[in-house]
């Protein structure tokens, strides 16, 4: 089993984000973008034998983890 990327805190954006609830903060360009499509429904946890963390999930599958949880794959919604 390969692990996903560890939490990348170099840009250390504070929690909570400066964005309104329907938005996510994009660290590449440092501003808020719509991310409502990304957050429902919640995906099943990956099993120990799951494939590598990057598979192109559809928006409805690409749910954000809570703060401190592992990163989840996300289509490049930008």
């Amino acid at each position: 089993m390969r692990r996903g990327p560890r939490s990348l805190r170099g840009r250390d954006a504070p929690a909570p984000t400066p964005c309104v609830p329907a938005e996510c903060f994009d660290l590449l360009v440092r501003h808020c973008v719509a991310c409502g499509l990304l957050r429902t429904p919640r995906p099943k946890p990956a099993g120990a034998s799951s494939p590598a963390p990057r598979t192109a999930l559809q928006p409805q599958e690409s749910v954000g983890a809570g703060a401190g949880e592992a990163a989840l794959p996300l289509p490049g919604l930008l």
């Epitope: 990327p5 990348l8 690409s62 490049g76 919604l77």
Partner: antibody, heavy 126, light 107 residues
Amino acid sequence: EVQLVQSGGGVVQPGRSLRLSCAASGFTFSSYGMHWVRQAPGKCLEWVAVIWYDASNKYYGDSVKGRFTISRDNSKNTLYLQMNSLRDEDTAVYYCARRFTHLRGWYIEDYGLDVWGQGTTVTVSS
Amino acid sequence: EIVLTQSPSSLSASVGDRVTITCRASQSISSYLNWYQQKPGKAPKLLIYAASSLQSGVPSRFSGSGSGTDFTLTISSLQPEDFATYYCQQSYSIPLTFGCGTKVEIK
């Protein structure tokens, strides 16, 4: 199969225009940001532009700003690069590529370009 | 913009060798560093993202490490199909930038 197929390259005179196309298949194109990257003969890779999944935001490299326009038609699963006022130094192989990101909490982290087109050659010459 | 400096610019190695390529950023980019492989006449292929995460389908002989300004791509046992040019790329900020490549040639 996830695929990006490019077209539209060719030979063009300085000052003229050209439009490149990048047709996507095998994935939900409308969910992905897309990039253009170029590579001049024997040179480094150079990022050209990026467009949001819904075309709401666009960014350009300094060398093409004001001359090139990135756009997309999600109904046709196609990405475009309109190149105006072409210069000799725009001669390169142009690649379209898909943006690769992860969502961590409410933060989007960028992890590069995970799917690339085959490239199309643009030659600017008088 | 963030400048990425790769070294060496080229190297000669034999099948089975351990190969190490370095990439240095002009400022700290945390772990937002990706590695690509490019063969002549082909598009680049993503190998490693987020400095150390192996892209799906990439052989485990490829690995990446580093954070901040100094990064390394390692090929643990060079295979015939690994002779290519390798590029680093930062996704810390716009404009995205690439290193100028390291060409791995047959000794």
